[in-house]
Structure formats: C-alpha cells, structure tokens
C-alpha cells in the first residue's frame, strides 16, 4: 500500500478552521490524484469531503463542501471550515492515484482535530 | 472475490461488426481504469483499448483506432467494445482486464472470417 | 514488434535460477512507470504474477521476483520447477501511446 503521512494533532483556530498538510509517497507516476477526508469518531467512520484534481491543477470539492485545499507535487495542504467543538475527532487522509494505471491507494494514520467553541463575549452595561 | 464475465465474442464476416461486453463484481468497478487485450491464436498479448475510471481518458492501439470504441457504465458495473469494419486480423480471444491487468476474465473468442 | 523487448525463449532444470529480461524506453519503464508480469499456463487466461516491479499478489511463490533499473526490469524465478513451464509477460504504461505495452512474450521451458 501507498504510504500518507499527516501531522498527528491539529488545533483548531478560533473560526473553526482547521489545516495540515497530507503527503503521500507516489510509487508511480500519477496525473490525476483523488483525495478524501474521513472522519472518526466513536469507531464511526464517515466521509467529510473529497476531491479529485489533475497533477498541478487546483483541488475541486463540492459547492457546498466544508474543505478547500491545494497540491503541490505529493503533497496536499488541505482546510476544514466551519468546525465546532462537537466535530473534534480524528480526520484520516485518503489517497488513490486514479490515473493512468495501476491503482494505488494509501490511508494516513489520522489528524486529531481538536476544536474548541469560543466562549460568548459577557454583555457590557 | 473479482470475476470479470466476457459475452458477445462469435464468428463474423469481415467488414461486420460485434458488441463485447465485461460483467464485473467483487470489487469499486467505478475507481479503475479498465482495459480490451487480446491474443491471436498461438500470438502474444496485445493491448486494444482502455478507459479511465471516469471515462475522460480512453486510449486505443494503432490497430483498431477509429473501428473500435471502449465504453462503460459504472452504475451497471460493466464494460464494453464496440468493434466496427472487422478485419481477419482481429480474431483473437479478447479478454477484460482490471487495472493494468490485475485482474483478467477468462475472455471471448471473436473469428472474423468468411 | 513489441514496444517492450523479452528473449522469445528461455529455459532450465529444475531447482536452477532463471532470469527474464524485458527491455523498453524513456516512455515507459523509463519514465518511472511500474513493470508488471504476467505467467500464462497453457490454455489459460493470463495471471498477474509481479505487480508493481516487485510485488507478489497474494499465492504466489516467493521464488519468483521482479526488479526493475532504468529503462529494463527482470523476472528471477529460483528453484525452478515443472509446473512453472508457460509464457511470460511484462507490461507497464507507455506516455506516447496513452496505454499499456506489453513485452512480446517468452516461453520458458523446464528441462529434464
């Protein structure tokens, strides 16, 4: 299997953004490259986003996806919006080069994503 | 466990034409690129045809370029070869390949003959 | 002709270390695309035996290997045996043809 290396925590900022870096180590030579973002959480596992994108093109997830993220060469610098304390857990990368053959897909060991909701600001007088 | 299930192979006159067809199960058909090979009697291997996962890239051999077309539905997990203006020199066992030919079927015999 | 070049035949005793060659160019094994082989029994289909210039899928045998070394790969099959007696393949993906090569085939013949 491919090899995905990802930092293993990761803190939230104050917005609910949240990003690391997902590199993978390619055996072959691939121009087109899918990514996917897995959450789990209490031994659920459920997809947050994907993307598949072109070598040097920009990653292109749904409209209405909570990701956004770029590639350079093996890596990709992915952001998670829109985050609340409710949604910490651990985010696995998922890598498969597509295209052209063969088939290879590698999985990460996970981001701890850790979020914390601001505290509400106290009402001046 | 992958099965690939070639149908549509038979004896057709030259000029005719015929539709293969690759039933596949046991594994995401929709995540690979698929491939037409085919061997003629007492030959070597010869790559036809191949698509990519979401048919965007599809690649023909010098041979069969603009008689043949690969196609596929990924919603029927199936893969297709339609085989135009047929020549002698395509009788051959036509086999469905997964990936870059990890998986084989155990493929179709086309005679193409008068 | 072939785009990837093997010897059309090749053969040994048993127990002996047999070697196949497979030769191509700066668009496929040496672009860095991965080698593959293939054993072939008589009036069978095809069975992937090398995946990825040095990977064995799962059942086969540890005496047969792959590696690969700029634009040439190698099949090493050690103790040779009868059942091993068929054709053998190589193929990878070719930039210039937007597809899979194969080699044109060797037949290996155990002796004796």
């Known amino acids: 299997a491919m090899h995905v290396a990802q930092p293993a925590v990761v803190l939230a900022n104050s917005r609910g953004t949240a990003s690391f870096v997902c590199e993978y180590a390619s055996p072959g030579k691939a121009t087109e490259v899918r990514v996917t973002v897995l959450r789990q959480a209490d031994s659920q596992v459920t997809e947050v986003c994907a993307a598949t994108y072109m070598m040097g093109n920009e990653l292109t997830f749904l409209d209405d996806s909570i990701c956004t993220g770029t590639s350079s060469g093996n890596q990709v610098n992915l952001t998670i919006q829109g985050l609340r304390a409710m949604d910490t857990g651990l985010y696995i990368c998922k890598v498969e080069l597509m295209y052209p053959p063969p088939y290879y897909m590698g999985i990460g060991n996970g981001t701890q994503i850790y979020v914390i909701d601001p505290e509400p600001c106290p009402d001046s007088d | 466990e992958v099965q690939l299930l070639e149908s549509g192979g038979g004896l057709v006159q030259p000029g005719g034409s015929l539709r293969l067809s690759c039933a596949a199960s046991?594994?995401?058909?929709?995540?690979?690129?698929m491939s037409w090979v085919r061997q003629a009697p007492g030959k070597g291997l010869e790559w036809v045809s191949g698509?990519?996962?979401?048919?965007?890239?599809?690649g023909y051999a010098d041979s069969v370029k603009g008689r043949f077309t690969i196609s596929r539905d990924n919603s029927k997990n199936t893969l297709y070869l339609q085989m135009n203006s047929l020549r002698a020199e395509d009788t051959a066992v036509y086999y469905c390949t997964t990936d870059l030919a990890r998986y084989w079927g155990q493929g179709t015999l086309v005679t193409v003959s008068s | 002709q072939s785009v990837l070049t093997q010897p059309p035949s090749a053969s040994g005793t048993p127990g002996q270390r047999v070697t196949i060659s497979c030769t191509g160019s700066s668009s496929n094994i040496g672009a860095g695309y991965d080698v593959h082989w293939y054993q072939q029994l008589p009036g069978t289909a095809p069975k992937l035996l090398i995946y990825?210039?040095?990977n064995r899928p799962s059942g086969v045998p540890d005496r047969f290997s792959g590696s690969k070394s700029g634009t040439s790969a190698s099949l090493a099959i050690s103790g040779l045996r009868s059942e091993d007696e068929a054709d053998y393949y190589c193929?990878?993906?070719?930039?210039?043809?937007?597809?899979?090569?194969f080699g044109g085939g060797t037949k290996l013949t155990v002796l004796g």
């Open positions: 698509i990519s996962w979401s048919s965007r890239d599809k």
């Open positions: 046991g594994f995401t058909f929709s995540d690979y690129y």
């Open positions: 193929a990878v993906w070719d930039d210039s043809l937007n597809g899979v090569v």
């Open positions: 990825g210039n040095d």
